[in-house]
Structures are given as structure tokens and as C-alpha cells.
Interface confidence: low
Amino acid sequence: MMTGTIETTGNISAKKGGSVILQCHLSSTMAQVTQVNWEQHDHSLLAIRNAELGWHIYPAFKDRVAPGPGLGLTLQSLTMNDTGEYFCTYHTYPDGTYRGRIFLEVLESSVAEHSARFQIP
């Protein structure tokens, strides 16, 4: 039975050209996390954090994605095209799969000044 829950940073915004941390946290379960997948709105994989293999950033994102902190992901050099949904998928044993959703809005610099409250500390 799956007892865990995924907590995410929810809806966030960040400046064009800046960076943002995408973060999910799995709680309320003793299940072992075997792998975390990070994917974009079109189901393209950004990165995988495998318990055995460590991090793998996919080639299309190597220049702009940094692993961490923790099981999170740092997206750099943001463009307007980065706006959209991001999903963290936790593969666990024995529970199975948990998935969380984050919506990122990339704003022009002038607009972003008024949206700092959405930024991750």
C-alpha cells in the first residue's frame, strides 16, 4: 500500500536568464527511493538520480541543468521557453511510483522583481 506523499515547491517563478531550484520531497513512507526522474512538460527527461548510478543529466540539458541540492534540480540560464510543468517521479521499493508537479513561470526581469515571494529560499 502506498502511504507516502510528495511535497513540491508548487507554482514558482523566476527571472529570464536566472536560475531556479526544482525540489520535491517524499514523506510519510519508509520505502527506499531507487530512482528520481525529472521531466519537462513534454515528457522529455531532464535528469535522473539513480541510487546506484548517481546523477545523469540528459545531453539536451547538460549546459543548463545542475544536479541538486539533494534530489532536486537546478535549472540555469532560464528562457521563456522553460515556462511550463515539471514533474518529479520517485521510483520506490516496495511502494512503487510517486509523482509530483511543479509549475514554473519564467518572467521578464522587470516583472520578476514583483514575484520574488515565489522563489525558493
Partner: antibody, heavy 119, light 107 residues
Framework: EVQLVQSGAEVKKPGASVKVSCKAS????????MHWVRQAPGQGLEWMGR????????KYNEKFKTRVTMTRDTSTSTVYMELSSLRSEDTAVYYC????????????WGQGTLVTVSS | DIQMTQSPSSLSASVGDRVTITCRAS??????LAWYQQKPGKSPKLLIY???TLAEGVPSRFSGSGSGTDFTLTISSLQPEDFATYYC?????????FGGGTKVEIK
């Protein structure tokens, strides 16, 4: 143009080892993981493992873990797959395949290397 | 480990036919599915990834659908060059299993 060129066919005796090479060109060699997939005569495709040419980190299918070694030479943009303790059921075509940009699917394949194990 | 099951294992069709091949995963794999075409004596060729994204240079008569455990490859109007064996593959994590293949033959 991305190209993966593999070494030629091999005939080996049971118990021997074989080392197949795969020379990559047309892209940044260290940016893409390289995988090996084999296909026995008239059979389907079987993933053997992969190597990260940037760090030499590798991951093998449990089935082959004790017998396979994948290495690379960045100076020649070549990856190698060595399979030891060969048996007749290892007779197959061995392919190197480059991972795609958005997942562990394979967007470019080598032409294949037939390895025949026979006494 | 995840297992991929394809059906049918073979089918006979005529040029112009609409052909559907199915692939079932033993557990939820979301959209992490690729399809390949392989002709005798040749290397496999990528057709589709992420369940529905057409690979570069692949004709639009090929399409993919599905998510979770059930997936479909459709060829809207079979052409002479489409007679081949088709494989599905789970493409996230480890190991990376392929389906057993579906051979599309001329009727």
C-alpha cells in the same frame, strides 16, 4: 553526420573472450552515454549495459554483470565491449547504440558485429 | 524488473492497410516508451520516443499513443518499405527491456 562504426565479425571458441569496438564521429563523444545491445539469431533485442564516456562510469544488465566490461578511449572516440567466458548462446550480433537526447532510447546504432561462438 | 509484452508477434497486411501494434508494460512506465523498426540484416531504427514523439526523418504515417502500461504503434497506410519487425522499449532506468517484437509481413 553521426556515425558509429563497429569492428568486424569474430569467431571464438567457448571459454574465450571477445572485444568489440565502436568508433563514434559526428558529435561530442563525451556528451552521450553509449549502450550495447545484442541480438541472437532470429531473436529479439537485449540490453547489455552502458558506459558514460565522460566519466567511464558503467552500468551492466545483471545477466552479464560478471562477464562484461565496457571501456572507452576518448582520444579516438571509441568505446569497447568485452565479453568473457563465451558460450554458444553468446552467438549474436552485438550493437553499440548512442542514447537519445531525452531518454535512454537509442537514436543512432552501429552496423552490428557478429560474434560466433563455436568449438 | 519491468517486462514489455508485444502483440501480435506477427501479422500479415497489404500495402495501404492501417496497422496497429500494441505493447504492454508490467507496471506503470508513464510515457517512457520507444518504438524501433528493424529490417533483416540491418540495425534497428528509432521511430518514436516518449511514447508519441516522432524521431527525426520518420514519415508521419507512423504514430504512437498510450501512457501508463498500454501503448500502440500505428502505421496509417502501410508502404512496401514498412514490412519489417517492430520493437518497443522502456527507456528510463535500468535495465532497459525491449518487447519481443512484431513481424509485419506481406499478405
Amino acid at each position: 553526420e553521426v556515425q558509429l562504426v563497429q569492428s568486424g565479425a569474430e569467431v571464438k571458441k567457448p571459454g574465450a573472450s571477445v572485444k568489440v569496438s565502436c568508433k563514434a564521429s559526428g558529435y561530442t563523444f563525451t556528451n552521450y552515454w553509449m549502450h550495447w545491445v545484442r541480438q541472437a539469431p532470429g531473436q529479439g533485442l537485449e540490453w547489455m549495459g552502458r558506459i558514460d564516456p565522460d566519466s567511464t562510469g558503467s552500468k551492466y544488465n545483471e545477466k552479464f554483470k560478471t562477464r562484461v566490461t565496457m571501456t572507452r578511449d576518448t582520444s579516438t572516440s571509441t568505446v569497447y565491449m568485452e565479453l568473457s567466458s563465451l558460450r554458444s548462446e553468446d552467438t549474436a550480433v552485438y550493437y553499440c547504440a548512442r542514447e537519445g537526447a531525452y531518454g535512454y532510447y537509442f537514436d543512432y546504432w552501429g552496423q552490428g558485429t557478429l560474434v560466433t561462438v563455436s568449438s | 524488473d519491468i517486462q514489455m509484452t508485444q502483440s501480435p508477434s506477427s501479422l500479415s497486411a497489404s500495402v495501404g492497410d492501417r496497422v496497429t501494434i500494441t505493447c504492454r508494460a508490467s507496471e506503470n512506465i508513464y510515457s517512457y516508451l520507444a518504438w524501433y523498426q528493424q529490417k533483416p540484416g540491418k540495425s534497428p531504427k528509432l521511430l518514436i520516443y516518449n511514447a508519441r514523439t516522432l524521431a527525426e526523418g520518420v514519415p508521419s504515417r507512423f504514430s504512437g499513443s498510450g501512457s501508463g502500461t498500454d501503448f500502440t504503434l500505428t502505421i496509417s497506410s502501410l508502404q512496401p518499405e514498412d514490412f519489417a519487425t517492430y520493437y518497443c522499449q522502456y527507456h528510463s532506468g535500468s535495465p532497459l527491456p525491449f518487447g519481443g517484437g512484431t513481424k509485419v509481413e506481406i499478405k
